[in-house]
Amino acid sequence: MNGSEYFVKIQSFLGGAPTEDLKALSQQNVSMDLATFMKLRTDAVLPLTVAEVQKLLGPHVEGLKAEERHRPVRDWILRQRQDDLDTLGLGLQGGIPNGYLVLDLSMQEALSGTPCLLGP
């Protein structure tokens, strides 16, 4: 069974998948479509790296541009380094600028909805 066939079988169970499962899935060449990706739990999507989302979506990663104003895409973009977003070739803006440190202050983030940044 190839990655695409596997994805079709598990698609309906993905809604509540934790980050760890999504990371594992990104190694399976599943080419998840964007509509399914956007139904995933936001808290499960946010920790995924650009490379992991690229692998998870495959050719459908191109659609992030079309859906950049909607959650969880918008929130995920805000969490990524701009340099990493640039590798997607989509002209996505809003990532963390070069030279900034991301502090994982869970309480701060829970209150504000955005990561805490320290400038260069």
Partner: antibody
């Protein structure tokens, strides 16, 4: 304004290969994915695949996996598609098309590939 | 693969008439989160390359005359030309961009009487 330049025609022999070019101008080449589409005379459109011009990552319609190879040259803002082991079934117009998000917002004029001995 | 079916395959209309063509997909093209339908319409005039008319099923591309109206959701879509002009003589294709391989309908050929 956005422009995609493609050669008008390519005449190739059966069994040979051909490398089609698509030179982009009028926009930032690495900010938009490129797609390739096949159209046989009097027939419909067939999606071949898409390529990320920033990383070179490419994805294919399974039907074209062993037929087509897409590449890009960022320095010249040019996308390429090589077609191999050509047969009469490969005689068609091949379009490059710049993505607008997912849809194909700008199309090149197309290259007519004729496979003939 | 998602199968796209267009109808009719051809039609002949007089200038000024209203025309509606149909496109059906074998599965939903609706993103239930964003409410966007992943469907585009293209026009291909004789001897030319296709041009984008409509994306997200109903969003008209910049510069496209407002007589071109996209509609529908889920699996059933339409392209309406509210008042056909002579320059609308062309083939019209729908395309899904929900899941690869992105697939096109067989096209509707519009002739002007």
């Amino acid at each position: 304004q956005v422009q995609l330049q493609q050669p008008g025609t390519e005449l190739v022999k059966p069994g040979a290969s051909v490398k089609l070019s698509c030179k982009a101008s009028g926009y930032t080449f690495t900010n938009y994915w490129m797609h390739w589409v096949k159209q046989r005379p009097g027939q419909g459109l067939e999606w071949i695949g898409n390529i990320n011009p920033s990383s070179g990552d490419s994805y294919y319609n399974e039907r074209f996996m062993s037929k087509a190879k897409m590449t890009v040259d960022k320095s010249s803002s040019t996308a390429y598609m090589q077609l191999s082991s050509l047969t009469s079934e490969d005689s068609a117009v091949y379009y490059c098309a710049r993505s607008g998000g997912l849809w194909l917002a700008f199309w090149g004029p197309g290259t007519l590939v004729t496979v003939s001995a | 693969d998602i199968v796209m079916t267009q109808s009719p395959s051809s039609l002949a209309m007089s200038v000024g008439q209203k025309v509606t063509m149909s496109c059906k997909s074998s599965q939903t093209l609706l993103n239930s989160v964003s409410q966007n339908n992943y469907l585009a319409w293209y026009q291909q005039k004789p001897g030319q390359s296709p041009t984008l008319l409509v994306y997200f099923a109903s969003t008209r591309e910049s510069g496209v005359p407002d007589r071109f109206i996209g509609g529908g959701s889920g699996t059933d879509f339409t392209l309406t030309i509210s008042s056909v002009q002579a320059e609308d003589l062309a083939d019209y294709f729908c395309q899904q961009h929900y899941r690869t391989p992105y697939t096109f309908g067989g096209g509707t050929n519009l002739e002007i009487k």
